[in-house]
Amino acid sequence: GITNINCSGHIWVEPATIFKMGMNISIYCQAAIKNCQPRKLHFYKNGIKERFQITRINKTTARLWYKNFLEPHASMYCTAECPKHFQETLICGKDISSGYPPDIPDEVTCVIYEYSGNMTCTWNAGKLTYIDTKYVVHVKSLETEEEQQYLTSSYINISTDSLQGGKKYLVWVQAANALGMEESKQLQIHLDDIVIPSAAVISRAETINATVPKTIIYWDSQTTIEKVSCEMRYKATTNQTWNVKEFDTNFTYVQQSEFYLEPNIKYVFQVRCQETGKRYWQPWSSLFFHKTPETVPQVTSKAFQHDTWNSGLTVASISTGHLTSDNRGDIG
């Protein structure tokens, strides 16, 4: 950066090199160039010469004043006009930053995704700080009092093997940057209560031609958790409102859920599960599309919507259509 240049003098910022966004700041430049009594001192911001708010303090020093400085980062340098020198002489440079102290981290959440081997902790960091902000995640055993600290700049994955102080912990997050430090409330967790079952996936759908056509959604999960509660939500793609069906599920076999739907309409389905009675849900699964047939038997296969074909079966329509979920973070 600009701070690595060889200096023939000194540049400094008041109140500091990193300061609160919107502050008035002063940048001082002091020349110390051999055989040079500067005629003029110039300031540059991001390579552009500043023309206003420059005050000469004495023979070697000048001040540049900014009101309500709002740029997150700027590279400043200053130069001198020396007699008998054709070009300006570089004095020194400095990178400056403005931003905000961190907000108190809140909504601290820790979950263990089944089979991941990790406890994943996330939080709401609050407003953008614009400057380098570090987070320390504290994990303290309620049984042994041992505390582990993890330094990160966003979320953290903590190996469950490193959680050797039993099952009960307190977790809290400390946020710090050059402008301040804040700390979250303590979250009390029990490792057995924060497991999210292995993802539930809708594999296919079929509409069976009967007096009242019915659609069967096939879905499954690799979870080993015995008591699992799930929700399936569905709607016509033209609708805003979801319908939700609840299930107590045993994943020893593929689940089949029946729906009585309107003909010739494109529907979207999603599923999510949680360990029964526990706090955290899976994110909703990928969007699964299925178009119900008209009264004529037809089948839809692979991806969102495909060519239809007549099978002559009682199965009127089959879909295996996915789209990535737009609700990845919905675990609350």
Partner: antibody, heavy 121, light 112 residues
Framework: EVQLVQSGAEVKKPGESLKISCKGS?????????MCWVRQMPGKGLEWMGC?????????YYANWAKGQVTISADKSISTAYLQWSSLKASDTAMYYC????????????WGQGTLVTVSS | DIVMTQSPLSLPVTPGEPASISCQAS??????LAWYLQKPGQSPQLLIY???KLAAGVPDRFSGSGSGTDFTLKISRVEAEDVGVYYC??????????????FGQGTKVEIK
């Protein structure tokens, strides 16, 4: 068995700087641990000053009254923690203890013998 | 800021008799509480940690109880060597930037 040995008593003038030390033996300095400093003014109770957490990263914590007044540091390579002042005041006259459990708990199984700091003009 | 409040501040005791000191935290500290004894001219020594666990080498006449905000240190039969100042200490967290002190004010135990 962990032992904490503190540097000797100091007599200083107001405005002078000072750095006192606490050398730990028997601590696994590759593990996570807290090393803390406690002040006891003449005839008074124990006052927590701050701690340094040494692990995969280093973090320092200060009592709000001690922030900006003292600096806590540690040199892992020689198993030593430090407490320093850049400008002493007469009110800094006290016994200073370092304390730890040699791990990342905040109760103190082990205490140094104390360093008496006297600040007087 | 968690504030630790001890009572009584002075406790005259009779050898052979029981004694009890109370410590109250201004907010929930779970079982993260320690007790120390500081004998005259000595460094403090740990008696109890995690509210009720006896530190190594501490006689079993000492016991601790409580969780949350209210804690008690009991001496079943006071001995002459138990005189000194007893301090409680919250050991929950020190990372909070507003902490003033983690120790109680101290309880001076002396023989009647």
């Amino acid at each position: 068995e962990v032992q904490l040995v503190q540097s000797g008593a100091e007599v200083k003038k107001p405005g002078e700087s000072l750095k006192i030390s606490c050398k730990g033996s028997g601590i696994d300095f590759n593990s996570n641990y807290y090393m803390c400093w406690v002040r006891q003014m003449p005839g008074k109770g124990l006052e927590w000053m701050g701690c340094i957490y040494v692990g995969s990263h280093v973090n320092t914590y200060y009592a709000n009254w001690a922030k900006g007044q003292v600096t806590i540091s540690a040199d892992k390579s020689i198993s030593t923690a430090y407490l320093q002042w850049s400008s002493l005041k007469a009110s800094d006259t006290a016994m200073y203890y370092c304390a730890t459990s040699g791990s990342s708990v905040l109760y103190f199984k082990f205490w140094g013998q104390g360093t008496l700091v006297t600040v007087s003009s | 800021d968690i504030v630790m409040t001890q009572s009584p501040l002075s406790l005259p005791v009779t050898p052979g008799e029981p004694a009890s000191i109370s410590c109250q935290a201004s907010e929930n500290i779970y079982s993260f509480l320690a007790w120390y004894l500081q004998k005259p001219g000595q460094s403090p020594q740990l008696l109890i940690y995690s509210a009720s666990k006896l530190a190594a080498g501490v006689p079993d006449r000492f016991s601790g109880s409580g969780s949350g905000t209210d804690f008690t240190l009991k001496i079943s039969r006071v001995e002459a060597e138990d005189v000194g100042v007893y301090y409680c200490q919250q050991t929950n967290r020190y990372s909070n930037p507003d902490i003033y002190n983690v120790f109680g004010q101290g309880t001076k135990v002396e023989i009647k």
